[in-house]
Each structure stands twice: as structure tokens, then as C-alpha cells.
């Protein structure tokens, strides 16, 4: 299976999104410019819908300058984000408390610099195992209704668990069509057997699959964003099939229950 890393296609177009062969895997980072075409139909995330405002206060956007979203992230501590390791960039900005994709000022927004990014030492580009990274912000957040952390689940997900994934990633695939506002999508955790059947020899216990039969999926640009189950952070958007939302090819997410010790110890050691 050919791997196509799309997290950085806005700055070095090795694999532009419209040339990735069907049926290949892709990391789900992207570049959504402030002038990206927005999708006026009801087709969201892929077949999700606009999130209700103030319901995802842990959702962060990672931006390349000037205001180009390339990945999502999650606030897990007043000064720390989690995102996918494949979203690592040396220079980026962090936006919290913002609902729309466009850079227009919103009263609840808070902007930050990342002062330290710590990928999991077991991550291996361009692979998918251990696809997580901690980012330390240049200061603590000011907790508000729009900006607050979420707890990471120490319990591993069971098949059938209902979860919510969110992001500003493309709402169509293989075309690239970015939404106006943050998208939310209800998905169900699949059994590890179904996950392994969908992606033979590519799944390990640092990943889980989620989706449904109705063509709902996360996609390019959602990478690093949250999968929330029963009120706590269960996973991060990591990778999936290309195009997104194909039957029997679910999204694959970083299985955070396997990393709670590493997350806690890394934050403590660097605070």
C-alpha cells in the first residue's frame, strides 16, 4: 500500500490531494487556506454537520502562517495540547476558542505559540503507530466557555461505543472542499477484528477504527483532532483510506488509552 502524507501538502506539494491514487492510505492533515472554497451543502466532515457553538472548547487549530489550518489538536491541560505526531511542524501557531475556519476575529478566541513539541518516541514517519505528540503552549489558557481542557480516557474503547469526532477538514473526497465552521460527526467504535480486516497487517493496539456504513468519516485536515467518547478524549484523528468515507474502510484513530502514562509523565517532566 502506498503511503501519502498530506499533512504538509500546503507547503511542499509532494502529493497534491487530487493526485493521490484511489485506495491508498493517507494521513489526515491538510492545508486549508483562509480563502479555501467553503461548502454550502449539508455535506460536512464527510456527512457530519456544523457543531453547536461552545460544545468543543478543547478543539484547537494548528496554523501555518498567515492563517492556514493544517491540523487539529486537543487541549488536555491548561498549557498542553495533544495532536498527531505526523502533524509536527517547526513553526506554527495555535488557535483555541474559534468556531469558523476563516481567520475573522471571534471574541472567544485565544492565540498561542507552541514552545515545545514532543512526538511520541515510538512514532515512525511515514508509519501510523504511536501517532501522537504533545505541544506545550507559551502560556496557560484563560479558561472560558470557549476554551477548556478535556480529560484523556484511561479506559480503552469497546466496540459499539458512540463517539464524536470534530474538525475543519475537507467535507468532500477526493475533491477538497473546506467547511465554514467546525464540523461534528457521530461515529461508532468498531471491533479490532473489523479494523484489522479493513486494513490487513496495518493495525496495532495503538490504533482503533471508527465509522459507520453510511459514508461518515473524518478526512484530510482533521488530523490530530479529538474523538470524544462518554465525555472524555478517547482518540485522535490519524489516518484512513483515500478517498475518505469509502465503504468498509473506516477512519483510524490513535488509541489514547495506551498512552495515559506517557502523556502524564511527559507533561510533568516538561512543566
Amino acid at each position: 500500500v502506498t503511503e501519502h502524507v498530506l499533512a504538509n501538502n500546503d507547503v511542499s506539494c509532494d502529493h497534491p490531494s487530487n493526485t493521490v491514487p484511489s485506495g491508498s492510505n493517507q494521513d489526515l492533515g491538510a492545508g486549508a487556506g483562509e480563502d479555501a472554497r467553503s461548502d454550502d451543502s449539508s455535506s460536512r466532515i464527510i456527512n457530519g454537520s456544523d457543531c453547536d457553538m461552545h460544545t468543543q472548547p478543547w478543539q484547537a487549530a494548528l496554523l501555518l502562517r498567515p492563517n492556514q489550518l493544517y491540523c487539529g489538536a486537543v487541549l488536555v491541560h491548561p498549557q498542553w495540547l495533544l495532536t498527531a505526531a505526523h502533524c509536527r511542524k517547526k513553526v506554527f501557531r495555535v488557535r483555541l476558542g474559534h468556531y469558523s475556519l476563516s481567520p475573522v476575529y471571534e471574541s472567544g478566541q485565544q492565540m498561542f505559540q507552541g514552545v515545545k513539541s514532543i512526538p511520541h518516541p515510538g512514532y515512525s514517519h511515514p508509519g501510523h503507530s504511536n501517532d501522537l505528540m504533545l505541544i506545550k503552549l507559551n502560556r496557560r489558557i484563560r479558561p472560558t466557555k470557549d476554551v477548556r481542557p478535556i480529560n484523556v480516557s484511561s479506559h480503552c474503547p469497546s466496540a459499539g461505543t458512540k463517539c464524536l469526532v470534530s474538525g475543519w477538514g475537507t467535507t468532500k473526497s477526493p475533491q477538497v472542499h473546506f467547511p465554514k465552521v467546525l464540523q461534528c460527526l457521530n461515529i461508532s467504535v468498531l471491533s479490532q477484528k473489523r479494523c484489522e480486516d479493513a486494513y490487513p497487517r496495518q493495525i496495532d493496539d495503538t490504533m482503533f477504527c471508527a465509522g459507520d456504513k453510511a459514508g461518515r468519516d473524518s478526512c484530510q485536515g482533521d488530523s490530530g483532532g479529538p474523538v470524544v467518547c462518554n465525555g472524555s478524549l478517547q482518540g485522535l484523528v490519524s489516518w484512513g483510506d483515500y478517498p475518505c468515507a469509502r465503504p468498509n474502510r473506516p477512519g483510524v484513530y490513535t488509541n489514547l488509552c495506551k498512552f495515559t502514562k506517557w502523556i502524564q509523565e511527559t507533561i510533568q517532566a516538561n512543566s
Epitope: N8, A85, K90, G122, P126, N138
Partner: antibody, heavy 117, light 110 residues
């Protein structure tokens, strides 16, 4: 054209301060991290430090307290100052741009600084 | 602190040879490793970043592999212009680091 050009005195007296500038052209400093690297004659590359657009600076542990890296107000030059120099600081000094994926893709031609009385 | 160790420090090879240079990190640096080529009197040139991604304009005879602590730069068929010194550099962390670069490997004509 994307270019980096180091400049500064080629000779510095022991215990003095080495001051170099790196003129940046062809790209905005606001989008990239910049590194200073040096190479003593006949030896390998030594990392000195990085400066980010947010003015966050990382220094090599040997350089802390002796080195200052900064960007000028016009955002067209990166500066390096190294204090209390000795003969061991004699080297070719390079500035370089990070490609945002942790690789130094653009380098200056380097400038030789000799520490001698 | 993370230390980068390159081996060998020098090697002799002929045009057309397959050449392998290794770089070992004292602890895992995941995939954040770059390789550079430097010729006498010149600035280094980026060859590979993210352990295996070829930099723009670099010939395909250069390849990089590895993750964690062990990395390899391979030149599949050595060309006359490849005789130079090669350096690895870790980009995993800048915290408490003496040097991000390895000590270098000089590739000489046999």
C-alpha cells in the same frame, strides 16, 4: 532568490565578543525558524541555537549564558553574539533556514571568524 | 541529552560502489533525522529529512531509512561528485543538547 549572507569581523580578540549578522532575502522570516551552526577548522558541524518567529530561542547547552541570537526590528536580519571568546571559538559560522520539517534547507556561504590577539 | 554517533568516521570507496553510513542516537528520536552533504570550503547541503524524505533536487541514488535510534544513509551507486563529508542531525529535541549533529563521515576515493 532565496539567500542568506553572513557578515561580521573576521578577527576577534580573546575575551571579546563575536558579533555576526545574517542577511535574509527571498522569504519572510516570520514563516521560518533560523539556526546558527559553526565549524571549527578541520572539524565537524556544531549547532549553536535556533530562533523562531515568535522570538522563542533554543541554545545548545554549551552556549547558554554566552550566546545571544536575535532578529532585528526590520525582520530582515538574524544576529549572533558570542561573548568571552577563546581560540576554541575560531570557526566558520553559518546561518541556515529550517524547512519547517526539521531540515536545514538554505545555508549561507559561511564566514570565518578567528579569535586571536 | 541526546548524542548522535556516526560510523564509520571515514571510508574509502570507488565510483559505482554502494555506500552505507549509519547514525545512532543515544535515545529514540522517532523519525526526526536529517542528512547533509558537505564539500571542502562549501556550506552543507540538505539531502534527506524526516529520516527518509529526499530534499528537493537531490538525486534518487541517495536514500535514508531508520527510526527510533538507528538510521542509515545509502548511496546506491557512488558518483564522482559524491566524494564529500556527510553529517546526520537530530530534530527531535533541542532541550539540554550539546550538539544536534553527528561527528561526520568522510567518503574518500579508494
Amino acid at each position: 532568490e532565496v539567500q542568506l549572507q553572513e557578515s561580521g569581523p573576521g578577527l576577534v580578540k580573546p575575551s571579546g565578543t563575536l558579533s555576526l549578522t545574517c542577511a535574509v532575502s527571498g522569504f519572510p522570516l516570520s514563516n521560518y525558524a533560523m539556526s546558527w551552526v559553526r565549524q571549527p577548522p578541520g572539524k565537524g558541524l556544531e549547532w549553536i541555537g535556533d530562533i523562531y518567529p515568535s522570538d522563542i530561542i533554543d541554545y545548545a547547552s554549551w552556549a547558554k549564558g554566552r550566546v545571544t541570537i536575535s532578529v532585528d526590528s526590520s525582520k530582515t536580519q538574524v544576529s549572533l553574539k558570542l561573548s568571552s571568546v577563546t581560540a576554541a571559538d575560531t570557526a566558520v559560522y553559518y546561518c541556515a533556514r529550517d524547512n519547517n520539517d526539521y531540515g536545514l534547507d538554505i545555508w549561507g556561504q559561511g564566514t570565518l571568524v578567528t579569535v586571536s590577539s | 541529552a541526546i548524542d548522535m554517533t556516526q560510523s564509520p568516521s571515514s571510508l574509502s570507496a570507488s565510483v559505482g560502489d554502494r555506500v552505507t553510513i549509519t547514525c545512532q542516537a543515544s535515545q529514540s528520536i522517532s523519525s526526526w533525522l536529517a542528512w547533509y552533504q558537505q564539500k571542502p570550503g562549501k556550506a552543507p547541503k540538505l539531502l534527506i529529512y524526516l529520516a527518509s524524505t529526499l530534499a528537493s533536487g537531490v538525486p534518487s541514488r541517495f536514500s535514508g531509512s531508520g527510526s527510533g535510534t538507528d538510521f542509515t544513509l545509502t548511496i546506491s551507486s557512488l558518483q564522482p561528485e559524491d566524494f564529500a563529508t556527510y553529517y546526520c542531525q537530530q530534530g527531535y529535541t533541542n532541550s539540554n543538547i550539546i550538539n544536534t549533529f553527528g561527528g561526520g563521515t568522510k567518503v574518500e576515493i579508494k
